[in-house]
């Protein structure tokens, strides 16, 4: 679940069996120059960053309700 | 590597209270939540909490909410379990328990701390 | 709080044989199960993860499946040191829980 930092694909690899209670927030890169696939980096209650799969759908639940959460904020 | 201490066993007077103590190191002790679990002899295991050491964030259990108080020092990266007015119901194996940061799973585990409660 | 039903709550099996233990969610659990080995007088130890995610250092013999309420843990080619007791645990909502147990013996 390493993150990278140049400008190229971000995720060397995702997690899984990621959990959302320790996400404080989800950053959804859509495919654009640098990278051709879509990344999603969630950032950790300590801090960290954890690359997680997009396809997964627990990801993608995790995705809609952090979104949710933002637009009722 | 990770490694979880708990303090030695206690034999303690019904009504009184018990402070027992989970040293962590081989790692950054203030980014898990540790978990507490209970296992009365002969019985499963209970969930009582937890509590992040970072911003000292706690989950309890409703059934511990009066009977635990779980508190944590960074300095010393031990994390704490206070179990109050005591009675025989207590008398338990306690055990302490980091929660990985991504995925919540326990991983690692103390050695466990009994507790007997007795007059 | 979500109720975990483990089953058997004894088991006893013959050396290189196989063993499955079954553990019902009260409500659906998104697959966060885990599954823990238990000897007296130590801590638990973390087998699997996330339904089939096996801990490093697991052998594996060790194999989870399941999804929505029902979850199942299998151990194949039983080996003198997998005598214990084995504990579902739900990771979904606090309060986490876990199954009742299953002891394992050798026959």
């Known amino acids: 679940a390493s993150v990278a930092t140049e400008l190229r694909c971000q995720c060397l690899q995702t997690l899984q069996g990621i959990h959302p209670k320790n996400i404080q927030s989800v950053n959804v890169k859509s495919p654009g120059p640098h990278c051709a696939q879509t990344e999603v980096i969630a950032t950790l209650k300590n801090g960290r960053k954890a690359c997680l799969n997009p396809a997964s759908p627990i990801v993608k639940k995790i995705i809609e309700k952090m979104l949710n959460s933002d637009k009722s904020n | 590597q990770v490694q979880l201490q708990q303090s030695g066993a206690e034999l303690v007077r019904p009504g009184s209270s018990v402070k027992i103590s989970c040293k962590a190191s081989g790692y950054a002790f203030s980014d898990y939540w540790m978990n507490w679990v209970k296992q009365r002899p002969g019985q499963g295991l209970e969930w009582i909490g937890q509590?992040?050491?970072?911003?000292?964030?706690?989950n309890y259990n409703a059934k511990f909410k009066g009977k635990g108080t779980l508190t944590a020092d960074k300095s010393s990266s031990t994390a704490y379990m206070q179990l109050n007015s005591l009675t025989s119901e207590d008398s338990a194996v306690y055990f302490c328990?980091?929660?990985?940061?991504?995925?919540?799973?326990?991983?690692?585990w103390g050695q466990g701390t009994s507790v007997t409660v007795s007059s | 709080d979500i109720q975990m039903t483990q089953s058997p709550s004894s088991l006893s099996a013959s050396l290189g044989g196989k063993v499955t233990i079954t553990c019902k969610a009260s409500q659906d659990i998104n697959k966060y199960i885990a599954w823990f080995q238990h000897k007296p007088g130590k801590g638990p130890r973390l087998v699997i993860h996330y339904t089939s995610i096996l801990q490093p250092g697991i052998p594996s013999r060790f194999s989870g499946v399941g999804s929505g309420r029902d979850y199942s843990f299998s151990i194949r080619n039983l080996e003198p040191e997998d005598i214990a007791t084995y504990y579902c645990l739900q990771y979904d909502n606090l309060p986490w829980t876990f199954g009742g147990g299953t002891k394992l013996e050798i026959k």
């Open positions: 328990a980091r929660e990985r940061d991504y995925d919540v799973a326990m991983d690692y």
């Open positions: 509590i992040y050491p970072g911003d000292a964030d706690t």
